[in-house]
Interface confidence: low
Amino acid sequence: EGVAAALTPERLLEWQDKGIFVIQSESLKKCIQAGKSVLTLENCKQANKHMLWKWVSNHGLFNIGGSGCLGLNFSAPEQPLSLYECDSTLVSLRWRCNRKMITGPLQYSVQVAHDNTVVASRKYIHKWISYGSGGGDICEYLHKDLHTIKGNTHGMPCMFPFQYNHQWHHECTREGREDDLLWCATTSRYERDEKWGFCPDPTSAEVGCDTIWEKDLNSHICYQFNLLSSLSWSEAHSSCQMQGGTLLSITDETEENFIREHMSSKTVEVWMGLNQLDEHAGWQWSDGTPLNYLNWSPEVNFEPFVEDHCGTFSSFMPSAWRSRDCESTLPYICKKYLNHIDHEIVEGGHHHHHH
């Protein structure tokens, strides 16, 4: 993460792709830099890690170089703003982004004092933009929860930043794992709580089925059984997509029986990719599989305009498919088709047909 002194547009775009940005005053054209004790406005072209910011969990604003979060000290709110430990309970660390303003509690917003220090004040409105993005709004980079897989916290979202091995991590890491899998802590201090999970890893799609996927040897399909998680349909859908997969689609009885066997010890209802999120389109699989095989529970209402628009699978019922409100939180199963290169890696060149 070493940042060169020269802030090239290309480098800036790379950071922005990771949700890391430089905060520039719209009117003063200078950028916020975190110093040892105060934040100041400096020339944006003199870039360094202390000018890089990222929205993190719980509405935090994390400074990459200072490894701390922007905090408002209630006992001296008009004092220059400073960085604090991101799980500090002594200050307010929550900031809202609204129409280019950064607002904290009690109508305090981030402003600039006459001496170019950054302060919190209720007096004026100061607008902030993302430097190098053509006047783009820093609100574009707001933190989105990243739900974990496996681990020991039942799909809880990553806590960013989290402290591990004396370092604050603002993204998932492979550090400390011999298997090189991406992981994060789900509380702010890993060593204290040891709460963690794997992160959805887009690069795992290139590798095939790693240890968090289970392979059906007859079909070159991998499945991931997240039976202890509790996510909404769209969260589950995103989690699968981020790993190069999709929510479960069931193409025939053979596949359904494979899923059933893997869930045999669990009385659990899980999300699958079946949905009618488009209120006119009827039910469809999220991965585009034609809806040729059906195993609806008898009580499902087939009106296209019913409230329940997402589909579930219950291994303990013979007619296993039901419709549910998509905001319900349930376990889920992901599915991933291996490509031909993966086939050769996994099977030594022996190809099988899909079901």
């Epitope: 999120l277 488009d278 209120e279 006119h280 389109a281 009827g282 039910w283 469809q284 699989w285 999220s286 585009g288 034609p290 809806l291 040729n292 087939f302 009106e303 296209p304 305009f305």
Partner: antibody, heavy 115, light 107 residues
């Protein structure tokens, strides 16, 4: 009110290409599946293609598979049909239509494939 | 793929007559069936969806019934403005096939 305004039709020679557009207004475009349907002169309605609300699912009639491509740009509220390797039998009025059962249709645009 | 057939292909009836058009799917499609009316030179108009639900603004003389493979569109009392071609369409899964149409005119 819901409006679907089509453009891009015309006369084209067999083997050539054409792109139809359909601009939507009056509803949240990004929440709806949109279809292309065509009608040859004096004939019935023929379903051509469909694209899901987010563009991830696309299906085609066998008669156009491999030659036509449906796409959408939700930021522009616009649906497209790219028609390649056109044949005389593709001559028809092409309609864009919203939804699964489709209450809202474009005004239609005539595509004539003729040498 | 599921095929859709309609009968009759055309019919003539008097004003005030009860008119019935049938549509058959080659495999079950639950109630995922719509009926459309198209007048010459006009855009198709949705009459009924989910086999029996009347689209808003459609006169109550139109009704639909059926489920699975066999469906019916009924016009309880034919009016001059009902002269048109009527199409059924399945929307259970792609392809979203239309029936070949039934042309209705006045004797």
């Amino acid at each position: 009110q819901v409006q679907l305004v089509q453009s891009g039709g015309g006369v084209v020679q067999p083997g050539n290409s054409l792109r139809l557009s359909c601009v939507a207004s009056g509803f949240t475009f990004s929440r709806y599946t949109i279809h292309w349907v065509r009608q040859a002169p004096g004939k019935g309605l023929e379903w051509v293609a469909v694209i899901s609300y987010d563009g991830s699912n696309k299906y085609y009639a066998d008669s156009v598979k491999g030659r036509f491509t449906i796409s959408r740009d939700n930021s522009k509220n616009t649906l497209y049909l790219q028609m390649n390797s056109l044949r005389a039998e593709d001559t028809a009025v092409y309609y864009c239509a919203r939804g699964g059962p489709t209450p809202d249709w474009g005004q239609g645009t005539l595509v004539t494939v003729s040498s | 793929d599921i095929q859709m057939t309609q009968s009759p292909s055309s019919l003539s009836a008097s004003v005030g007559d009860r008119v019935t058009i049938t549509c058959r799917a080659s495999q079950g499609i639950r109630n995922y069936l719509a009926w459309y009316q198209q007048k010459p030179g006009k855009v198709p108009r949705l009459l009924i969806f989910a086999a029996s639900t009347l689209q808003s603004g459609v006169p109550s003389r139109f009704s639909g019934s059926g489920s699975g493979t066999d469906f019916t569109l009924t016009i309880s009392s034919l009016q001059p403005e009902d002269v048109a071609t009527y199409y059924c369409q399945k929307y259970y899964s792609a392809p979203f096939t239309f029936g070949p149409g039934t042309k209705v005119d006045i004797k």
